[in-house]
């Protein structure tokens, strides 16, 4: 009886610890709102584990809800900056398979130069996940300002 | 070969339920910009669960990847005087050793009374972490207003 | 000896997958600043796996460290606007059972016209969850603009 | 147990100044911060300075270049020395200090008056 109990432990790798912190690498060209991101032990302290980069955007590997964060600084920024070019808005949002395409997550600036936020998601394996920063200003690639990331939370 | 499924699977112990939220307990004298921490169930709803306080400052015990989170909230506060009071910033860091200092996390206040955020990040043990909070604006004790905490997320 | 080991794993139903991502329904009546929130897969990605929905409202049922996490964006705001009617402040606490009434996390809007957060704190089951908004203005219900959420985190 | 009671209160004129005196009785140890709070008619309570062990300051905007903010070095006494009175300062005037504990502790109130 003992022994059936055990059988209804939860492996190791069914624990999902799929988990990535990304850092800006670079915006797009015009007309691409979409920011590029990069992760890696030798970029510093950003990191991919099961996750994966398809041309700078996050493509999610397993099934799951997932805690989605992000922080982004604009870089060269006051509030009087902000509020002239107004709206200024950052939206993560799940952009292929095209027919799962919806924003998750959307925030302005307003008279402020930073927005951070998270939230709670079910992403499914090939979701890949885009971030736009829609605006003239450009974001800080500085990475304790800049940042975006996934955390596997439950199947 | 059932028996040998279960070796797979995940000791409690290592699971790493490792976490702690803190609340202010007071700001540094002037020229150090450190806010000093507290916690335990004594105070309120703030406790430790694997890392320690450090004369105030936050020191983890298990090596892996800490969501790590803070909300502060500017005591005596209006858009105006935190333009007026402009740049007040608050930065996350390790702080010791000093061979792994960084920054982790930096916000400015511009008009808001209030900055929040979230990151993952990889920590070791022994690594200490500071909030130092610039500028001459005080942070609010408040509970609810103000608070810093890590959660272990994985090896 | 390898099968007392196995006894000290962690059986998959105690890892208290509880998580909830909620989307707002709507406001109460007047004198009534609470924000009424409704959840599951017929409504898109909100979701109730655990906690339950009480008259619009987040009951608790595993005690543990949770996360809690909000986001709500004013419906129709500018800067101007926010600072017109400012205070606008949102309040998240235990609203029942009335001995355990606290407020957890608390934001005002000043200038914005987003606020955004996320604390960890200790809830027990039957502890029922209330975001008060106070003041003059609407919240979005736009899914990507306006959610609250909790994720249960360790015992 | 705490107390706190202040008193320097009155009717003064507009440009005029006050000393509002915050005395503590009692065992008082581990104070981290001490504020005043005023309150008019019909408002809610307003924090109007803060002074901190280390000795910071910070004075709301309505007040701020007018008011004072200080302590003794026990925390035996808070003290806030209002210059430039104006009609709006108007209010009861209470005293608060903050324990490392998160005990609150609170004066009765004094009245200030000013007429134009």
């Known amino acids: 009886q003992r022994f059936a109990q055990a059988q209804q432990q939860l492996p190791l790798e069914s624990l999902g610890w799929d988990v990535a912190e990304l850092q800006l690498n670079h915006t797009g060209p015009q007309q691409d709102p979409r920011l590029y991101w990069q992760g890696g032990p030798a970029l510093g302290r950003s990191f991919l584990h099961g996750p994966e980069l398809d041309k700078g955007q996050l493509r999610i590997h397993r099934d799951g809800i997932y805690m989605v964060h992000i922080q982004v600084t604009l870089a060269i920024c006051s509030s009087t900056t902000a509020s002239r070019h107004h709206p200024t808005t950052l939206a993560v949002g799940i952009c292929s398979p095209a027919s799962r395409s919806i924003s998750l997550l959307r925030l302005s600036f307003h008279q402020g130069c930073t927005i951070a936020s998270q939230r709670l998601t079910p992403l499914a394996r090939g979701d890949t996940l885009c971030t736009n920063l829609t605006g003239t200003l450009l974001p800080s690639r500085n990475t304790d300002e800049t940042f975006f990331g996934v955390q596997w939370v439950r199947p | 070969q059932r028996f040998a499924q279960a070796q797979q699977q995940l000791p409690l112990e290592s699971l790493g339920w490792d976490v702690a939220e803190l609340q202010l307990n007071h700001t540094g004298p002037q020229q150090d910009p450190r806010l000093y921490w507290q916690g335990g169930p004594a105070l309120g709803r703030s406790f430790l669960h694997g890392p320690e306080l450090d004369k105030g400052q936050l020191r983890i015990h298990r090596d892996g990847i800490y969501m790590v989170h803070i909300q502060v909230t500017l005591a005596i506060c209006s858009s105006t005087t935190a333009s007026r009071h402009h740049p007040t910033t608050l930065a996350v860091g390790i702080c010791s050793p000093a061979s792994r200092s960084i920054s982790l996390l930096r916000l400015s206040f511009h008009q808001g009374c209030t900055i929040a955020s979230q990151r993952l990040t990889p920590l070791a043990r022994g690594d200490t972490l500071c909030t130092n909070l610039t500028g001459t604006l005080l942070p609010s004790r408040n509970t609810d207003e103000t608070f810093f905490g890590v959660q272990w997320v994985r090896p | 000896q390898r099968f007392a080991q196995a006894q000290q794993q962690l059986p998959l139903e105690s890892l208290g997958w509880d998580v909830a991502e909620l989307q707002l329904n709507h406001t109460g009546p007047q004198q009534d600043p609470r924000l009424y929130w409704q959840g599951g897969p017929a409504l898109g990605r909100s979701f109730l796996h655990g906690p339950e929905l009480d008259k619009g409202q987040l009951r608790i049922h595993r005690d543990g460290i949770y996360m809690v996490h909000i986001q709500v964006t004013l419906a129709i705001c500018s800067s101007t606007t926010a600072s017109r009617h400012h205070p606008t402040t949102l309040a998240v606490g235990i609203c029942s059972p009335a001995s355990r009434s606290i407020s957890l996390l608390r934001l005002s809007f000043h200038q914005g016209c987003t606020i955004a957060s996320q604390r960890l704190t200790p809830l027990a089951r039957g502890d029922t969850l209330c975001t008060n908004l106070t003041g003059t203005l609407l919240p979005s219900r736009n899914t990507d603009e306006t959610f609250f959420g909790v994720q249960w985190v360790r015992p | 147990q705490v107390q706190l009671q202040e008193s320097g209160g009155g009717l003064v004129q507009t440009g005029g100044s006050l000393r509002l005196s915050c005395t503590a009785s009692?065992?008082?140890?581990?104070?981290?911060?001490g504020s005043w709070y005023r309150q008019a008619p019909g408002n809610q309570r307003e924090l109007v300075a803060i002074i901190t062990s280390g000795g910071a300051t910070n004075y709301a905007d309505s007040v701020a270049g007018r008011f004072t903010i200080s302590r003794d070095s026990a925390w035996k006494a808070l003290y806030l020395q209002m210059n430039s009175l104006k009609p709006e300062d108007t209010a009861v005037y209470f005293c608060?200090?903050?324990?490392?504990?998160?005990?609150?502790?609170w004066g009765q109130g004094t009245q200030v008056t000013v007429s134009s």
């Open positions: 608060n200090m903050e324990s490392v504990r998160y005990r609150n502790y």
């Open positions: 009692g065992s008082i140890f581990d104070i981290v911060r």
